[in-house]
């Protein structure tokens, strides 16, 4: 009678096992083992028991012990079951971003693993089991469908295999796939709202605001603002489910013309875009040209106003004739024109908007000096001892220097309050002098003596 120990073995793939072949007779003619596996007999004394090390066991096998005794030949089989965990446990790749409300199919593929009767495939969201199925086929495939919800955002989906060898006295061997982290999102169908100037002048700054409501998760939204090829760098403010992106835009002469302003919102694998046109224009202030900014009285002066070729100008409220970018007027300079402002107003239509620019120049008229009766009376009569202020105003541009002297030496204190004395009486020669020349005028001061009763 041949016996084998152990009669049943479960061992890891590539592992080794010691198998003892025994026979009931003391002096067997033959005692051995038949197996395709690499074997090595242990060196042990005795005739009726032999131990073999069977190594590199890669698959289930049934080595057979045999013995030949006087009463005949017999055999005994041992059953070697190989176990190994799957070589590949993988979730089929999916885009990490998924829109809320979409049906998502999770597919797990399992390659290898044995014994298959003890192998189970589990699909999980976090630690929650979504589906559990035995591993069938090579590769085994298990699928489940998940309706994507907002609260799934950031959830980890994974696939786990369980090789349960606890009934065989071993443990539960688990293999888990790399997790798939789901990023859920909501991007509304409405395009973002874009607020910006319709027209923008060269070498100025404008403000662009792009906003959108109903986003999830708003912090993950990417905002791209651009004017033509120029990427803008917005400051983004987030609300609960909204954002507002504000950017400053500077334009140069190179940008002149119609430019596309775009605001694109990217969330997940979707985007929404709003386009607007902005007209970049160049409109320098009109130029007011005086023949000379400073002229002498009586000189003929030409005032010209020149503006952008497409502008329409008015000069001192008078439209150009014909209506266009140039206007002029002629005048003979009078003292009254000194300090006179000549204002040119230009209007340019840009993308249906009227843009106004003004420029003002002042004319300086040189005249005088003048001394006349009104401002410098020729005769003053004042009671003695009274308080008086002699007044004499010389006119002219530049303002003349005025001196009033009696006998060439005694000054009349113009503009000062004085007590009238006998010494003040007399005729004074008032002289007004400027770069334009000089004038003189005689002023007589009479002093009335008090009457003694």
């Amino acid at each position: 009678q041949t016996s084998v120990s152990p009669s049943k073995v479960i061992l890891p793939r590539g592992g080794s096992v010691l198998v003892t072949c025994s026979t009931s007779c003391d002096q067997p003619k033959l005692l051995g083992i038949e197996t395709p596996l690499p074997k090595k007999e242990l060196l042990l004394p005795g005739n009726n028991r032999k131990v073999y090390e069977l190594s590199n066991v890669q698959e289930d096998s049934q080595p057979m012990c045999y013995s030949n005794c006087p009463d005949g030949q017999s055999t005994a089989k041992t059953f070697l079951t190989v176990y190994w965990t799957p070589e590949r446990v993988e979730l089929a790749p999916l885009p990490s971003w998924q829109p809320v409300g979409k049906n998502l199919t999770l597919r797990c593929q399992v390659e290898g693993g044995a014994p298959r009767a003890n192998l189970t495939v589990v699909l999980l969201r976090g630690e929650k089991e979504l589906k559990r199925e035995p591993a069938v086929g090579e590769p085994a495939e298990v699928t489940t469908t998940v309706l994507v919800r907002r609260d799934h955002h950031g959830a980890n989906f994974s696939c786990r295999t369980e090789l349960d060898l606890r009934p065989q006295g071993l443990e539960l061997f688990e293999n888990t796939s790399a997790p798939y982290q789901l990023q859920t999102f909501v991007l509304p169908a409405t395009p973002p709202q874009l607020v910006s100037p319709r027209v923008l002048e060269v070498d100025t700054q404008g403000t662009v605001v792009c906003s959108l409501d109903g986003l999830f998760p708003v912090s993950e939204a990417q905002v791209h603002l651009a004017l033509g090829d120029q990427r803008l760098n917005p400051t983004v403010t987030y609300g609960n489910d909204s954002f507002s992106a504000k950017a400053s835009v500077s334009v140069t002469a190179e940008d002149e013309g119609t430019q596309r302003l775009t605001c694109a919102v990217i969330l997940g694998n979707q985007s929404q875009e709003t386009l607007q046109t902005v007209t970049i224009y160049s409109f320098p202030a009109p130029n007011v040209i005086l023949t000379k900014p400073e002229v002498s009285e009586g000189t003929e002066v030409t005032v010209k106003c020149e503006a952008h070729p497409r502008a329409k100008v008015t000069l001192n409220g008078v439209p150009a004739q014909p209506l266009g970018p140039r206007a002029q007027l002629l005048l003979k300079a009078t003292p009254e024109d000194n300090g006179r402002s000549f204002s040119c107003s230009a209007t340019l239509e840009v993308a249906g908007q009227l843009i106004h620019k003004n420029q003002t120049r002042e004319l300086r008229v040189l005249y005088g000096p003048r001394l006349d009766e009104r401002d410098c009376p020729g005769n003053w009569t004042w009671p003695e001892n009274s308080q008086q202020t002699p007044m004499c105003q010389a006119w002219g541009n530049p303002l003349p220097e005025l001196k009033c002297l009696k006998d060439g030496t005694f000054p009349l204190p113009i503009g000062e309050s004085v007590t009238v004395t006998r010494d003040l009486e007399g005729t004074y020669l008032c002289r007004a002098r400027s770069t334009q020349g000089e004038v003189t005028r005689k002023v007589t001061v009479n002093v009335l003596s008090p009457r003694y009763e």
Epitope: L18, L42, L43, L44, P45, G46, R49, E53
Partner: antibody, heavy 117, light 111 residues
Framework: EVQLLESGGGLVQPGGSLRLSCAAS????????MSWVRQAPGKGLEWVAF????????YYADSVKGRFTISRDNSKNTLYLQMNSLRAEDTAVYYC??????????WGQGTLVTVSS | QSVLTQPPSASGTPGQRVTISCTGS?????????VHWYQQLPGTAPKLLIY???NRPSGVPDRFSGSKSGTSASLAISGLRSEDEADYYC???????????FGGGTKLTVL
């Protein structure tokens, strides 16, 4: 870490008896073949006795056959050597050793047995 | 008188290569049984040094190597060091005796 610790050695008169013990740890004792090997003072190593993992088969060197008995208690992880009718030539350091199936892979530190009147 | 014969002593200077022989018969080494070597440092238990003719257990330096041919085997130690000073034993199995055999041992001295 595999450890084998012998005890029970000492001085005994010729014709006397002694029981050696070997406490095993760090491996599955019940799956291991075990042996006793001795070394007389200043001499070489000599195999003495051998026992199967389950205690079912025992083998002895001719020099000790009929006088020594090897046994084991797998529940206590302990190997024994009962030595009777001791002779002066049995004086030696006795080592317990684990047998791999081809060689002795782990040895204890030994216990000295002195047989003298 | 051991059935496996070893020279009682061997010596060498540090850095040298030393060889220890082990001779058996047709019922042991010559029958195809593997040879194993043990090192016994002074005052300690034997330790497995080489198994299955030429394999080293983990932790044994590669300065130690073994070989087997016919009815004999040998242990070679290269780059000899003072800490190699010990007794070295060969071991095999004898089918006619149904017993494990040890050589008489070789005392290695590092000069």
């Amino acid at each position: 870490e595999v450890q084998l610790l012998e005890s029970g050695g000492g001085l005994v008169q010729p014709g006397g008896s002694l029981r050696l013990s070997c406490a095993a740890s760090g491996f599955t004792f019940s799956n291991a073949w075990m042996s006793w090997v001795r070394q007389a003072p200043g001499k070489g190593l000599e195999w003495v006795a051998f026992i199967w993992y389950d205690g079912s088969n025992k083998y002895y060197a001719d020099s000790v056959k009929g006088r020594f008995t090897i046994s084991r208690d797998n529940s206590k992880n302990t190997l024994y050597l009962q030595m009777n009718s001791l002779r002066a030539e049995d004086t030696a350091v006795y080592y317990c050793a684990r047998y791999s199936g081809w060689y002795f892979d782990y040895w204890g530190q030994g216990t000295l047995v002195t047989v003298s009147s | 008188q051991s059935v496996l014969t070893q020279p009682p002593s061997a010596s060498g200077t540090p850095g040298q290569r030393v060889t220890i022989s082990c001779t058996g018969s047709s019922s042991n080494i010559g029958a195809g049984y593997d040879v194993h070597w043990y090192q016994q440092l002074p005052g300690t238990a034997p330790k497995l040094l080489i198994y299955d003719n030429n394999n080293r257990p983990s932790g044994v330096p590669d300065r130690f190597s073994g070989s087997k041919s016919g009815t004999s085997a040998s242990l070679a130690i290269s780059g000899l060091r003072s800490e190699d000073e010990a007794d070295y034993y060969c071991q095999s199995y004898d089918s006619s005796l149904s017993a494990w055999l040890f050589g008489g041992g070789t005392k290695l001295t590092v000069l």
